[in-house]
């Protein structure tokens, strides 16, 4: 059978390297070989092209090199298939070369910030060596933060006669390192060169751009005064290498801003000792560069009625992270304030804390919280400079199966009946949220029963027992994960009762 | 800048081989085709051939087909020229000349300072 | 082989005069000429490629015209540095062939 039409001819001239033409070959069924016809100078000479290899992935393809290629320029493409039973040719296809150019890529030699203009890296680069001189280039340049992964982009050309190979990239974070990569392409091609090494380049320093502050309120003392633990982080956004030298702090009764008290710390959090009325703290963050915005917060009177807005709250774990949802009764409330911290014996020291704006959701990755580990979750309406009731739940990151099972005891033995009786689980043991138990048991060379009952319930009374007859119990505590057994224990139902 | 430098001069007897080196520097060896022009004393300019670097691919006048050799050596950017049985009429001045534009095949932008090989008995 | 005839071999002119060498090709190479000076005991400079391409940092007095067969090189005033050598080249295809040559000389 004659050979398959050549289809979906496709060339790219590799700039004073080669022009390289491909096509998809169809189904040879016997040794095919490939010409390719081209006319060049436009239309004024013509060669051919043929493949010698012996691999038919290689021979969908063929080469021309210099000095038979000429920029601009205008080709024709037509790729002859030959076997023993005749030729085909493929359609003619047209190309023009500076459409189908492709360079190397720009080398980056310098990327530096430029002193006094904020917020802006200049890129200085070679262009490729090898680059058409009668052409003006374009060029891509992409940018991210060393931590990030998503790349931002920004397309711009040059004149060929500018020597001034720099681009200045505005409208950056301050103090913050980018990864730059540049690329280029002959202005009217479709193809562009590789991407160019990274290079690295800071951004220069600013003030620190802002504060985030939260509370926790304590019960007041004997002598009425309250202990409040002021806590603050830089901004959301703020550059991951911002310095900052101190924090200034002010504070005063909202009834009286005369008694305004003041102190400094270079800690991130300060413990303050309050009257039971309102007050309204003041902060700001300071380096050698000069101070931060004011962060501002009110601290409610002890006996005041803070709102309650939140009606149900649930957590969940999807696709590596925990996810918090709630319903709120109040319209007007769209931030709120969440803290987590685990669930420990002792008194909390790693106290987390976030906003959240315009949703009624959040979500952690997995991998922030401790597996196993049970987290207290409590969500603040927040209302202006008002703070609403908070609703707190518990939750997992990731549940295992407990790491032992319940202590079980017996009790009230009796002929048919028994009471089986366990104790909780310690929660550093749990490993996730007890959902329900289950107790086996089983007489001696009998048949094994269970009985499951919600986590709730810490006793069950077995009943239709065999008199006279030794048993073994075991009951078994169970997360999502799966479950654990407590100890087996074994007991005899008594022969009569004393109500028989 | 663009600079082809070529190797010094040589006295060859009849019969004998020369090989003349040109050695670039100032752009992409591999990116550019060398070629080689001869000129006799006071004749005019003789094309010999010419070598593409990035592929090796050469094209050979068939003047001198059977007796000439491109060669280039892509690790040190130099191209060879060596021409055999060596007769006096190929006394001359050998030049290694490099193509320099997108839009003109086979034009000699750049020229080597030229090597005189002197054939003599 | 494209065999390129360079008439006069030589011509005598003086400075400021408009001196004009033409070319010949045995066949058709379209556009594809090249023009050369060579000054004694250099190597040859390329002046016009295309038949009318100035190369770069070419004086604009130096042209080229013509196309097909028939080939010129114009200098429209000629200059105390322009005595020289002048080759026509074709650069259709190889093998290359150069014209015999010209020689300015001062009148």
């Known amino acids: 059978a004659l050979p398959a039409k050549p289809e979906n001819i496709s060339c790219v001239y590799y700039y004073r390297k080669n022009l390289t033409c491909t096509w998809s070959p169809g189904k040879e069924t016997s040794y095919t070989q490939y010409t390719v016809k081209r006319t060049y100078a436009f239309g004024e000479k013509h060669d051919n092209c043929t493949t010698n290899s012996s691999t038919s992935e290689n021979r969908a393809s063929c080469s021309f090199f210099l000095p038979r290629i000429t920029i601009p320029d205008n080709y024709t493409i037509e790729v002859e298939a030959e076997n023993g039973d005749g030729v085909i040719k493929s359609h003619m296809t047209y190309w023009r070369l500076e459409n189908i150019a492709k360079t190397e890529p720009p080398k980056i030699f310098r990327v530096k910030p430029v002193l006094g203009i904020k917020r802006m890296i200049q890129i200085e680069w070679i262009k490729p060596e090898l680059a058409p001189v009668s052409s003006d280039l374009k060029y891509t340049l992409r940018f991210r933060t060393v931590n990030s992964t998503s790349w931002m982009e920004v397309n711009f050309a040059k004149n060929r006669k500018d020597k001034n190979q720099t681009y200045n990239l505005t409208g950056l974070q301050p103090f913050t390192e980018y990864v730059i990569a540049l690329r280029c392409a002959v202005k009217e091609s479709k193809f562009w060169s590789d991407w160019s090494q990274e290079k690295m380049g800071m951004t220069e320093e600013e003030a620190p751009c802002g504060l985030e502050l939260w509370r926790v309120l304590k019960p007041a003392e004997a002598d009425g005064r309250r202990p409040v633990r002021l806590l603050w982080k830089k901004a959301r956004g703020a550059p991951v290498l911002e310095k900052t030298l101190g924090y200034n702090i002010w504070y005063y009764p909202e009834s009286n801003t005369n008694l305004t008290e003041t102190m400094n710390t270079t800690n991130q959090q300060l413990e303050l000792h309050l009257g039971g009325e309102s007050f309204w703290v003041s902060m700001i963050s300071y380096n050698s560069l000069g101070k931060s915005p004011v962060a501002t917060l009110r601290i409610p009177a002890i006996q005041e009625k803070s709102f309650q807005c939140i009606e149900v709250m649930q957590a969940c774990v999807a696709e590596d992270q925990l996810v918090v949802k709630w319903q709120s009764s109040a319209l007007d409330v769209n931030t709120w304030m969440i803290e987590w911290f685990p669930d420990v014996d002792s008194e909390p020291t790693t106290l987390s804390w976030e906003s959240v704006s315009q949703a009624t959701n959040w979500t952690i990755q997995q991998d922030k919280l401790k597996p196993f580990w049970c987290y207290n979750i409590s969500v603040y309406p927040m209302l202006h400079d008002k703070v609403g009731e908070p609703y707190s739940i518990q939750a997992y990151a990731k549940e295992g199966v407990p790491s032992e099972g319940p202590e079980t005891k017996v009790e009230n033995i009796g002929v048919k009946t028994v009471t089986i009786t366990w104790k909780e689980i310690p929660k550093s043991e749990r490993k996730g949220i007890i959902c329900n138990y289950t107790i086996f048991y089983q007489a001696e060379g009998g048949k094994g029963f269970s009985k499951t009952v919600n986590s709730s319930i810490l006793q069950y009374g077995l009943e239709s027992l065999k008199r006279k007859t030794s048993y073994i119990v075991q009951v078994m505590a169970s997360t999502s994960a799966g479950g654990t057994n407590g100890t087996s224990i074994n007991f005899k139902t008594l022969s009569f009762s004393v109500f028989e | 800048q663009v600079q082809l430098v070529q190797s010094g001069a040589e006295v060859k007897k009849p019969g004998a081989s020369v090989k003349v080196s040109c050695k670039a520097s100032?752009?992409?060896?591999?990116?550019?085709?060398l070629n080689w022009v001869r000129q006799a004393p006071g004749q005019g300019l003789e094309w010999m051939g010419l070598i593409n670097p990035y592929n090796g691919g050469t094209d050979y006048n068939p003047q001198f087909q059977d007796r000439v050799t491109i060669t280039a050596d892509k690790s040190t950017s130099t191209a060879y020229m060596e021409l055999s049985s060596l007769r006096s009429e190929d006394t001359a001045v050998y030049y290694c000349?490099?193509?320099?534009?997108?839009?003109?095949?086979?034009?000699?932008?750049?020229w080597g300072q030229g090597t005189l090989v002197t054939v003599s008995s | 082989d494209i065999q390129m005839t360079q008439s006069p071999s030589s011509l005598s002119a003086s400075v400021g005069d408009r001196v004009t060498i033409t070319c010949q090709a045995s066949?058709?190479?379209?556009?594809?000429v090249a023009w050369y000076q060579q000054k004694p005991g250099k190597a040859p400079k390329l002046l016009i490629y295309?038949?009318?391409t100035e190369a770069q940092g070419v004086p604009s007095r130096f042209s080229g015209s013509g196309s097909g067969t028939d080939f010129t090189l114009t200098i429209s005033s000629l200059q105390p540095e322009d005595f020289a050598t002048y080759y026509c080249?074709?650069?259709?295809?190889?093998?290359?062939?150069f014209g015999g040559g010209t020689k300015v000389e001062i009148k």
């Open positions: 295309n038949a009318q």
């Open positions: 080249q074709h650069h259709y295809d190889s093998p290359l062939t």
């Open positions: 066949e058709d190479i379209y556009s594809f």
């Open positions: 000349a490099r193509d320099g534009y997108d839009d003109g095949p086979y034009t000699l932008e750049t």
């Open positions: 100032g752009y992409t060896f591999t990116g550019y085709v």
